[in-house]
């Protein structure tokens, strides 16, 4: 339960995180489990501990094994295990399964490939990206921060992608590579000017003072995965978050994909304990995407409770 697998290549940097978490001020001790030998904290060592992190700079095949981390908190010690395997570098181009990180899938509209584990390292842009050992070149490929963006993804873009970057530790540079598979979802999608299904334009919604009320803004944007699409509510032309009325909150509904393949979004506006002044506000349902913005306006009116007295 408190164990995590980590792997790397010989002569590359590898940084491993303790599976147990604590406060920044807690001490973390690391041990090599087979010998129960303490891992030093001095950075002059090739393998050293730095708080929650265990650093192999660089890693060697002989470093493989189970490492124990103990997070020392005021009331009890939390023990975790890092199962580390360091592999020899392959001479050929194939990346074996045991070196692969989780597969990601993308489509024509969404093709980000994140470089695995990069957040653990002290690196500077740009990243280098390779597919099947070939450096990626051309305007379709953009290395942005810690991920690769592929424009106009095609089925041929599926494959194994390797990111390569340099980790810097006290002025010394170490290479790191990480590989993951990318699959392409075949989606014949398109995008349209937003169509608001609800509410109707200039709809009057009846509400009861003192009760809760919900308004749903629902819009469709096309078919398949949409690159940019959003629905939101505004009060008197102001974003809900900026309006500053805690009784009125918006909440994202379910992303919907109907049987006809249309991609639709819902945003529910919840008004708790409706007050008189809420009837004076203008409620705008906004739907926007790359084509533009559509707005439907709703106003509230008082619903007189049914008189049950004879």
């Amino acid at each position: 339960k408190f164990s995590k697998q980590s792997w790397g290549l010989e002569n590359e940097a590898l940084i491993v995180r303790c599976p147990r978490q604590g406060k920044p001020s807690y001490t973390v001790d690391w041990y090599y489990s087979q010998t129960n030998k303490s891992i030093p904290t001095q950075e002059r060592n090739r393998v050293f501990a730095s708080g929650q992190l265990l650093k192999f700079l660089p890693a060697a095949v002989a470093d493989s094994g189970i490492y124990t981390c103990i997070v020392r908190s005021p009331t009890f010690n939390r023990t975790g295990y890092a199962n580390v395997t360091i592999y020899k570098k392959q001479s050929d181009c194939n990346v074996p399964d045991y070196l692969m990180y989780s597969t990601v899938s993308g489509s024509e509209k969404n093709s980000k490939i994140y470089c695995p584990t990069i957040d653990l390292y002290n690196w500077t842009a740009p990243l280098e990206w390779f597919k099947n050992c070939q450096a990626l070149q051309g305007s379709r490929y953009r290395a942005h921060k810690s991920f690769l963006v592929i424009d106009n993804v095609m089925t041929e873009d599926a494959g194994d992608y390797t990111c390569k970057f340099i980790h810097n530790e006290n002025g010394a540079n170490y290479s790191v590579t990480a590989t993951r598979s990318f699959t392409v979802k075949d989606e014949q999608g398109f995008s349209l000017f937003p169509v608001i299904g609800a509410p109707a334009q200039n709809e009057i919604k009846e509400v009861e003072i003192g009760k809760n009320a919900n308004l749903t803004c629902s819009a469709c944007f096309g078919k398949g995965t949409q690159f940019l699409a959003a629905v939101l509510w505004q009060l008197n032309g102001t974003k809900i978050t900026d309006f500053g009325e805690p009784r009125i909150q918006q909440e994202e509904g379910q992303n919907q994909s109907f049987s006809n393949g249309l991609a639709c979004l819902d945003m529910v506006l919840r008004i708790a304990d409706v007050k008189e002044e809420d009837l004076l506000l203008q409620y705008d349902c906004l739907a926007l995407n790359l084509h533009g913005l559509r707005r439907h306006t709703v106003r509230l009116s008082r619903k007189n409770p049914i008189d049950h007295h004879s």
């Epitope: 001020s25 005021p74 009331t75």
Partner: antibody
């Protein structure tokens, strides 16, 4: 900059469940645990539990054991708190707060109203 | 569970006054392993989210004005506002940051005369 954005207000009936989300940005989600704290109207803050975001291990406060479930989705950098068998005294603002020496980062709060 | 008791529950002071709030814990919050006192102080303005002022009993969170200071060790702790300002109108909470369940004091409401 670090931001924790919570889901919107909820109105629930007694006996129902509520699930509140907390989306983190501006830092590496799995580097810090996430706490959940609630505050009933006019009352003190009350710690409900926390989750180790790296391995998904939750720890719950005794007052909530059996009723609360804290989970996380690392791919979405989001933590969730689900409270079941709601009663009127669960009406409160629910906050997520990032673990640290003290809670330096809080979500904006989610008002949960339990009313028949 | 560690009980946190704050006093006073409310106070009224003038702008420029020195304000002191005390907090007592039912068990020591000192961790001998690193000599840290795991106590935090928060400020909560009406209708707002709590804001961390002090952690480790005496370390001021970045961006917090220097008029706020924390002291104490073991079971007795103090939050001091050296010169009260109008924007300090709020409720102040201490918190056991030492062991589960993390517990909060009942709060001290500070009003401006």
């Amino acid at each position: 900059q670090v931001q924790l954005v919570q889901s919107g207000a909820e109105v629930k009936k007694p006996g129902a469940s509520v699930k509140v989300s907390c989306k983190a940005s501006g830092y590496t989600f799995i580097n810090y645990g996430m706490n959940w704290v609630r505050q009933a109207p006019g009352q003190r803050l009350e710690w409900m539990g926390w989750i180790n975001t790296y391995i998904g291990e939750p720890t719950y406060g005794d007052n909530f054991k059996g009723r609360v479930t804290i989970t996380r989705d690392t791919s979405a950098s989001t933590a969730y708190m689900e409270l079941s068998s709601l009663r009127s005294e669960d009406t409160a603002v629910y906050y997520c707060a990032r673990e640290g020496d003290g809670f330096a980062y809080w979500g904006q709060g989610t008002l949960v109203t339990v009313s028949s | 569970d560690i009980q946190m008791t704050q006093s006073p529950s409310s106070l009224s002071a003038s702008v420029g006054d020195r304000v002191t709030i005390t907090c007592k814990s039912s068990q020591s919050l000192l961790y001998s392993g690193n000599q840290n006192n795991y106590l935090a102080w928060y400020q909560q303005k009406p209708g707002k989210v709590p804001k961390l002022l002090i952690y480790g009993a005496s370390t001021r969170e970045s961006g917090v004005p220097s008029r706020f200071s924390g002291s104490g060790s073991g079971t007795d702790f103090t939050l001091t506002i050296s010169s009260l300002q109008p924007e300090d109108l709020a409720t102040y909470y201490c918190q056991n940051d030492h062991s589960y369940p993390y517990t909060f004091g009942g709060g001290t409401k500070v009003e401006i005369k």
